[in-house]
Interface confidence: medium
């Protein structure tokens, strides 16, 4: 025997109190699939969570984060504060990257500069707190007699000294 509830479409629920008739989801609730016996409560985006997509009878609301924060986790389950480029988030807030490390985003951790010598290359542009070093040709390629290489003009000032 077919379950009468299977005929209830998304946006409705199978109301046991009304002889399993399909009733619309009440305000601020939804059902995203058919045959549901209940509707789920809509997510409310408040505080640092902003509404990216309103709740409908067939789909949950979606949140993102207010300016100064970015989403983390499935479905933006957390809002984490942004830092500036050249910084990372620590337990005490945003801190500058240590010398020898960089972060070119508003999130994430400071990462070590590329070690050009590991690839047998030279440093073409020094690293900064915000940018990785740019590796150039290997020292052998720059020896007399080798084809000349004109390095591009650095996009920014050379790396800073240790703090």
């Amino acid at each position: 025997l077919q379950d009468p509830c299977s005929n209830c479409p998304a946006g409705t629920f199978c109301d046991n109190n009304r002889n399993q008739i399909c009733s619309p989801c009440p305000p601020n609730s939804f059902s995203s699939a058919g045959g549901q016996r209940t509707c789920d409560i809509c997510r409310q985006c408040k505080g640092v969570f902003r509404t990216r997509k309103e709740c409908s009878s067939t789909s949950n609301a979606e949140c993102d984060c207010t300016p100064g924060f970015h989403c983390l986790g499935a479905g933006c389950s957390m809002c984490e504060q942004d830092c500036k480029q050249g910084q990372e988030l620590t337990k005490k807030g945003c801190k500058d990257c240590c010398f020898g490390t960089f972060n070119d985003q508003k999130r994430g951790i400071c990462r070590p500069w590329t070690n050009c010598s590991l690839d047998g290359k030279s440093v073409l542009v020094n690293g900064t707190k915000e940018r990785d070093v740019v590796c150039g040709p290997s020292p052998a390629d720059l020896s007399p007699g080798a084809s000349s290489v004109t390095p591009p003009a650095p996009a920014r000032e050379p790396g800073h000294s240790p703090q």
């Epitope: 505080g47 504060q81 337990k91």
Partner: nanobody
Framework: EVQLLESGGGLVQPGGSLRLSCAAS????????MSWFRQAPGKGLEWVAV????????YYADSVMGRFTISRDNSKNTLYLQMNSLRAEDTAMYYC??????????????????WGQGTLVTVSS
């Protein structure tokens, strides 16, 4: 009854100062990170500043950085917002909020479970 009650709002001239207070009752204030939010007329809710449960970690929106200072006195169950160099664009209803889950600068969804009723700040000459 769990309650947050803001006070200290009012009319102030541009460049002036105000100190908002938020008195907490009915819950263990020292277990909660606290934030200030504001809502300007016709605008959405804007986060202003947060302070961790023990007061060691503070973070501010760029728009108020260097002008506003958030602080708390857990012995008095009170949150404060010292507002200096006020501008017309700071005009808003200011709300305090308590959230149980604030870790490493992150708010977890569903953690904003205690809200005040707000206090109005008007900056005008």
């Amino acid at each position: 009854e769990v309650q947050l009650l803001e006070s200290g709002g009012g009319l102030v001239q541009p460049g002036g100062s105000l100190r908002l207070s938020c008195a907490a009752s009915g819950f263990t204030f020292g277990d909660y990170a606290m934030s200030w939010f504001r809502q300007a007329p016709g605008k959405g809710l804007e986060w202003v500043a947060v302070i961790s449960d023990d007061g060691s970690n503070k973070y501010y929106a760029d728009s108020v950085m260097g002008r506003f200072t958030i602080s708390r006195d857990n012995s008095k169950n009170t949150l404060y917002l010292q507002m200096n160099s006020l501008r017309a664009e700071d005009t808003a209803m200011y709300y305090c909020a308590g959230h149980y889950d604030y870790v490493w600068g992150s708010f977890r969804y569903g953690a904003f479970d205690i809200w005040g009723q707000g206090t109005l700040v008007t900056v005008s000459s």
